[in-house]
C-alpha cells in the first residue's frame, strides 16, 4: 500500500504516518551546551 511518509503540507496526503509534523515549529529554547 502507498505510504504517505513525510508528505508536504502542500499536499492533500496526510503526514501522520511520517511521525513528523507537516510544518514543525521552531523550538523556543536552546539546550544547555
Amino acid at each position: 500500500s502507498e505510504t504517505t511518509t513525510g508528505t508536504s503540507s502542500n499536499s492533500s496526503q496526510s503526514t501522520s504516518n511520517s511521525g513528523l509534523a507537516p510544518n514543525p515549529t521552531n523550538a523556543t529554547t536552546k539546550a544547555a551546551g
Partner: antibody, heavy 115, light 112 residues
Framework: EVKLEESGGGLVQPGGSMKLSCFVS????????MNWVRQSPEKGLEWVAQ??????????RYVESVRGRFIISRDDSKSSVSLQMNNLRTEDTGIYYC??????WGQGTTLTVSS | DVVMTQTPLALSVIIGQPASISCKSS???????????LNWLLQRPGQSPKRLIY???NLDSGVPDRFTGSGSGTDFTLKIGRVEAEDLGVYYC?????????FGGGTKLEIK
C-alpha cells in the same frame, strides 16, 4: 518492499569533503520528505538535515552545527537523496542514516573524520 | 532545542515480565493540528533503528501488540506487556513537533 541504501562513507581528514548518497525504492519518493540522521557514541542519534518536496521548492532544513557546511539535495527522477559535507570536523564522525520521516531507515554508512 | 530525557538508561528484564520506559520532553509536543508527534524506535544490536510507534500510541505494521505507547504533552511511556528475547536493544523516543527534531538518549533493554 521498502529499501533505503546509503553509500559514500569512509575516512576523510579534518577540513575535507565527502558526499553521501541514498537510493530509495518501495514507496513514492517524490512525495516524501527525506532526512539524514547521524549516530555517534558521544552524541547518540542526531537529526542532521531535511529536504522537502518540489511543491515546497525543495526547502531544506539543517541542524545548527552543520548549517553552512552541509548541503542536502535530491533527484526525484533517480529516487535519490545526497548529503554534500564540506569543511568536515572530527565531531562529524558517525554512522549516517537516510530516513523518510521516522518510519523508514537505511542501513547506514560510516564517516570517520580523522587525521 | 527540545530536550528528550529517557529513563531508565538500562533495564534488565526476565523474559515474560513487563517493562516500562519513560520519555519526558522539555516542551509540549502537542502540535497546532491537535496531534502529538512522539515516536518510539528500537535499535537492535548491529542494526539501524526501526520505528515501533508513532503519534504517541499508533503501532507500526508488524509490531506486536505487547507494545503500547501512552502519554501527552511532555510525559510519555512505552510499555512492553511481556518481554521476549527479540525485544533486546536500545529504545529511543524522538519528537517531530519542533525543529530541530530531537532524540532521547536511549534505554538499553537487556534480557536477564
Amino acid at each position: 518492499e521498502v529499501k533505503l541504501e546509503e553509500s559514500g562513507g569512509g575516512l576523510v581528514q579534518p577540513g575535507g569533503s565527502m558526499k553521501l548518497s541514498c537510493f530509495v525504492s518501495g514507496f513514492t519518493f517524490s512525495n516524501s520528505w527525506m532526512n539524514w540522521v547521524r549516530q555517534s557514541p558521544e552524541k547518540g542519534l542526531e537529526w542532521v538535515a531535511q529536504i522537502q518536496l518540489k511543491s515546497d521548492n525543495y526547502a531544506t532544513r539543517y541542524v545548527e552545527s552543520v548549517r553552512g557546511r552541509f548541503i542536502i539535495s535530491r533527484d526525484d527522477s533517480k529516487s535519490s537523496v545526497s548529503l554534500q559535507m564540506n569543511n568536515l570536523r572530527t565531531e562529524d564522525t558517525g554512522i549516517y542514516y537516510c530516513s523518510s520521516g521516522t518510519d523508514y531507515w537505511g542501513q547506514g554508512t560510516t564517516l570517520t573524520v580523522s587525521s | 532545542d527540545v530536550v528528550m530525557t529517557q529513563t531508565p538508561l538500562a533495564l534488565s528484564v526476565i523474559i515474560g515480565q513487563p517493562a516500562s520506559i519513560s520519555c519526558k520532553s522539555s516542551q509540549s509536543l502537542l502540535f497546532s493540528n491537535g496531534k502529538t508527534y512522539l515516536n518510539w524506535l528500537l535499535q537492535r544490536p548491529g542494526q539501524s533503528p526501526k520505528r515501533l510507534i508513532y503519534l504517541v500510541s499508533n503501532l507500526d505494521s508488524g509490531v506486536p501488540d505487547r507494545f503500547t505507547g501512552s502519554g501527552s504533552g511532555t510525559d510519555f511511556t512505552l510499555k512492553i506487556g511481556r518481554v521476549e528475547a527479540e525485544d533486546l536493544g536500545v529504545y529511543y523516543c524522538v519528537q517531530g513537533t519542533h525543529f530541530p527534531y530531537t532524540f532521547g538518549g536511549g534505554t538499553k533493554l537487556e534480557i536477564k
